[in-house]
């Protein structure tokens, strides 16, 4: 009988304790927001906000500029000064709640928890490969704003998500804010609004469209806006909120809200419940039919998918898919099954489901008892009637009012529970060659880069490494700059190559040479490495 090499178990062919050091920046305080900019030439920047300060970094994560954004009322606050001599409100620290790019100008817009949640606009001025912030413009016109009607009050201290869309020659800010009774009473931010930036950068145009949680529900019904993005003809917000206005407010679920990106109006505002489940291949006795629900979205990202995953999802390569990491409850604590699951929702399918829901509500024959929903935003009504009305009047259209689609969109965990005890806190998805890779940050400060495939009973790791020694959670928002992703953990920003930090965690030559082509791994004497790490022979074709 022929002798054969003993088979190395898959798990023994890699070592996730291998230390990788990636470039980092110490921000001097807990990172609150981060955004990246890449210009037409090779100028680029990373903007990092901490309490009372905004850092501008070059592509090498070296500091280019640093601006004091607070405390409000402090003479050293460089942004506050843009609003003219104060006082403009109660003194206090500025926590950055919004940090977004307006690509049309281009400009950076930052909005904080102080000064009624107003925003500041900084034109981006390139200088070589770096980018600088011009002097800030205060997006607040005192004479246009009142506590009950404040177009320039954008950020809520409880959290705000913003997506900027260019329409014609104007920039529209799609804003979603978490509210409670106290916040709603102070300069009235809205739950969802679309605001046009005035051409003279003096603030936002009055008379903007908005939806808000009705005063009677503000105490018990809170909406957390987890993510927002723009793709195709729509802007989407992802929320975690109570499943019902009337039932237990701690029974949460996840919704997708869709707004038109081409018309700045809210008549076609639609919501759809997203249902993500863990359905083990062998169902335990007593486990729920259809799988265990994971109703609470923790993080999300949308991206076009590679060929392999596209085939598994029965969609075309390059189509946009919304990926979400879900947990069982707010604390994300352990139950039966994994701590985190990942579900994939193709955007075209989401749109189709929403459109079908509108047809069910508005096209006769309408199913009796079908509710328009969104009772926290509007008066209850049955389809096809407008909110609060018993019937449609001849000059109104059923379609011109917000609607909760009556069916939900259900998906199962792409990783088949294989994330196990890992608590995922950050997610960014990229397409590399024909492979779709999920770049995930974890509660204990690690980065997992894993191929997104369904059909396996093990995870295909590009990498799994610790960002540093602090072990602090990786924060929700991830940004891309060129071929790198920027993750924040504690007071640090880390720059992680999308093709992985290296190859040293592959321990055997066989495993090394089976690594994805984009990783650039080869066998180097007695270790797996990239060509630049190998002064001697470097072999990508065969093992010694």
């Amino acid at each position: 009988e022929d002798w054969q090499c003993p088979r190395t178990p898959y798990a023994a062919s890699r070592d996730f304790d291998v230390k990788y050091v990636v470039p980092s920046f110490s921000a001097g305080g807990l990172v609150q927001a981060m955004v990246t900019y890449e210009g037409d030439r090779n100028e680029s920047a990373v903007f990092v906000a901490i309490r009372n300060r905004l850092h501008v970094l070059g592509p090498d994560l070296k500091s280019v500029q640093s601006l004091a954004t607070g405390p409000a009322g402090d003479p050293g606050c460089q942004t506050c000064a843009a609003c003219g001599p104060g006082p403009h409100g109660p003194p206090g620290d500025t926590d950055t709640k919004v940090l977004v790019l307006d690509p049309a100008l281009p400009a950076l817009v930052s909005c904080g928890s102080s000064l009624q949640g107003r925003c500041f606009l900084h034109d981006l001025e390139p200088q070589g490969t770096a980018v600088h912030l011009a002097a800030p413009a205060c997006l607040f016109s005192a004479h246009h704003n009142r506590p009950d009607d404040c177009p320039d009050c954008v950020a809520s201290p409880l959290g705000t998500r913003v997506t900027v869309v260019e329409q014609g020659q104007a920039s529209y800010f799609y804003v979603a804010s978490s509210l409670d009774a106290a916040v709603a009473a102070s300069f009235s931010p809205r739950s969802v609004s679309i605001r046009r930036l005035k051409a003279d950068a003096s603030g936002f145009a009055p008379g903007f469209v908005a939806l808000s949680v009705l005063p009677k529900h503000l105490v018990s019904y809170s909406i957390e806006y987890v993510h927002s993005f723009h793709t195709g003809a729509f802007v989407y917000f992802l929320t975690v909120q109570p499943a019902s206005v009337t039932d237990d407010p701690s029974a949460l679920h996840t919704r997708l809200a869709r707004l038109s990106a081409t018309e700045p109006e809210l008549g076609d505002y639609r919501e759809l419940v997203l249902d993500c489940r863990f359905a083990p291949k062998r169902r335990r006795r007593g486990a729920p039919e259809g799988g265990q629900p994971y109703p609470v979205l923790r993080v999300a990202h949308s991206a076009p998918v590679g060929a392999q995953l596209a085939t598994e999802l029965s969609i075309a390569e390059g189509q946009e898919v919304l990926f979400g990491v879900f947990v069982t409850g707010k604390d994300g604590g352990p139950g039966v099954g994994p701590n985190s699951v990942v579900c994939a929702f193709p955007i075209d399918l989401l749109d189709t489901l929403i459109d079908e829901g509108v047809e069910r509500c508005c096209e006769s024959p309408v199913h009796p008892g079908l509710r328009r929903g969104l009772d926290f935003f509007q008066s209850p009504s049955f389809c096809p009637n407008p909110p609060g009305l018993e019937a449609l009047s001849p000059n109104t259209s059923c379609r011109h009012f917000p609607l909760l689609v009556s069916s939900s969109f259900s998906r199962v965990d792409l990783f088949n529970g294989l994330l196990g005890p890992v608590q995922v806190t950050a997610l960014y998805v990229t397409r590399l060659d024909n492979v779709t890779v999920a770049h995930m940050g974890t509660m204990d400060g690690r980065i997992l880069q894993v191929e997104l495939v369904r059909s396996l009973n093990y995870l295909l790791y590009v990498s799994n490494f610790s960002l540093g020694d602090s072990g602090q959670p990786v924060q929700r928002d991830v940004s891309r700059l060129g071929d790198h992703l920027l993750f924040a953990s504690g007071d640090q920003v880390f720059q992680v190559p999308i093709q992985g930090p290296g190859c040293r965690h592959f321990l055997t030559c066989g495993r090394c040479l089976r690594a994805w082509h984009f990783m650039g791994c080869g066998w180097c004497g007695n270790m797996c490495g990239q060509q630049k790490e190998c002064p001697g022979s470097w072999q990508q074709d065969h093992c010694p």
């Epitope: 210009g39 500029q65 640093s66 000064a81 843009a82 001025e125 390139p126 200088q127 600088h132 002097a135």
Partner: antibody
């Protein structure tokens, strides 16, 4: 040493157009904004506008907007300012000046020697 | 546009004197202010940026102060080569605007 060298003096008739050049050396034109400044005889300085040669993005003073065009030729590291529909009050010295960020703040750190434009019938 | 008002428009001083020139902005400009020196027939030269920072190669007898709307250029001990015209400039908003200038003459 960074240098900005401007073209020579010009005499023009009212209604004509003048185009002044500013050739830079010892730095890359595309890396910094280039500004143009007017100084009428015995008067102060007035900012006309600027260009970022890397992207050709321009910004003008409203006072000059209808008559001025600022351009750059990156192949020759030269910036240009063209002023049309000349009138006698355009008689002045015109300077090109590079602006650069120093930390958080910007300033015009290098200037050309100036070009005298005389408008006379 | 932001107006920059410089005063005095001219002053006479002797070598060794302490000279102060002020500049008032019509609205707050933080510290987005520069000072330039111009000699007859020459281009302006940058002295101070960010209201208080000395440009490379500028003698330490020059200093700048102020923020918001009120700014000052001080020459602690006037030297013969300092007789010139001085301009402030705001770089907070375009159009960038200059003060009217202060001519420092020999007494």
């Amino acid at each position: 040493e960074v240098q900005l060298v401007q073209s020579g003096a010009e005499v023009k008739k009212p209604g004509a157009t003048v185009k002044i050049s500013c050739k830079v050396s010892d730095y890359t034109l595309t890396d910094f904004y280039m500004n143009w400044v007017q100084q009428a005889p015995g008067k102060g300085l007035e900012w006309i506008g600027r260009i970022y040669p890397g992207t050709d993005k321009t910004r003008y003073n409203e006072k000059f907007r209808d008559r001025v065009t600022i351009t750059a030729d990156t192949s020759t590291d030269t910036a240009y300012m063209e002023l049309s529909s000349l009138r006698s009050e355009d008689t002045a010295v015109y300077y090109c000046a590079r602006s650069a960020y120093y930390g958080n703040y910007v300033a015009m750190d290098y200037w050309g020697q100036g070009t005298t434009v005389t408008v006379s019938s | 546009d932001i107006q920059m008002t410089q005063s005095p428009s001219s002053l006479s001083a002797s070598v060794g004197d302490r000279v102060t020139i002020t500049c008032l902005a019509s609205q707050t400009i933080g510290t987005w202010l520069a000072w330039y020196q111009q000699k007859p027939g020459k281009a302006p030269k940058l002295l101070i940026y960010a209201a208080t920072s000395l440009a490379d190669g500028v003698p330490s007898r020059f200093s700048g102060s102020g923020s918001g709307t009120d700014f000052t250029l001080t020459i602690s001990s006037l030297q013969p080569e300092d007789f010139a015209t001085y301009y402030c400039q705001q770089l907070y908003n375009t159009p960038w605007t200059f003060g009217g200038g202060t001519k420092v003459e020999i007494k």
